[in-house]
Amino acid sequence: AYRPSETLCGGELVDTLQFVCGDRGFYFSRPASRVSRRSRGIVEECCFRSCDLALLETYCATPAKSE
């Protein structure tokens, strides 16, 4: 189970992103429009530091707009 704040690396990070983002998919670097001063890429953020659910969700792709 995903723990609130931890280091996530390798396949565990990929699997966690797939779980959190579901059908939306995800980016390993945030798209330009969503870049913040902290945009180091998710491996850098989660593996070399630590990350929480909120941070993981910022790497999910934007859901397609429905009519």
């Epitope: 390798g10 396949g11 070399f48």
Partner: antibody
Amino acid sequence: QVQLVQSGAEVKKPGASVKVSCKASGYTFTSYYMHWVRQAPGQGLEWMGIINPSGGSTSYAQKFQGRVTMTRDTSTSTVYMELSRLRSDDTAVYYCARDVQWLAYGMDVWGQGTTVTVSS
Amino acid sequence: DIQMTQSPSSLSASVGDRVTITCRASQSISSYLNWYQQKPGRAPDLLINAASSLQSGVPSRFSGSGSGTDFTLTISSLQPEDFATYFCQQSYSLPFTFGGGTKVEIK
């Protein structure tokens, strides 16, 4: 072609330090993480740590924490691994190896290895 | 840390034989398992990643399977150049860990 070229063999005394270099060519140096792996004579492979050549961030195996330092020089596309307080059981071949992607899919390009011998 | 246990540690086989090497993880690693081949005096070469994905240039006689904790490397028809040591490695979580190796020798 994609290549990692390591520095030459070293002979060190116990307690000394060694610094091994690994020069990358044939690809964008800052786009791939770099691992260091060692292999004692006749033994298996042991992962030591990883460096992000882009930002310089590192993560080390607990066993080497406090004794190993990994650095990089983007101007020469070179990563370095320094191991201090050497002991006889640090005698090994040290390899740098490029990560495939996202730290999830192995190491696809390896240096030729650097033999480090620790002996009094 | 995740422990990787390889078996057998060595085996003797003849050219043309089908060879199977197994690797077991101490906890589930999904499909994040890589296989390497190492010849004496050389660096390892990545053969297979993600449990079953053959690397470019690797002969199709090599195949990998498994997920969770149990994985297999199969050489369908052993060739003279395949006599080497094979290592598995998990890339599920840090620290990355390797199996102890399987040395494939000529019978």
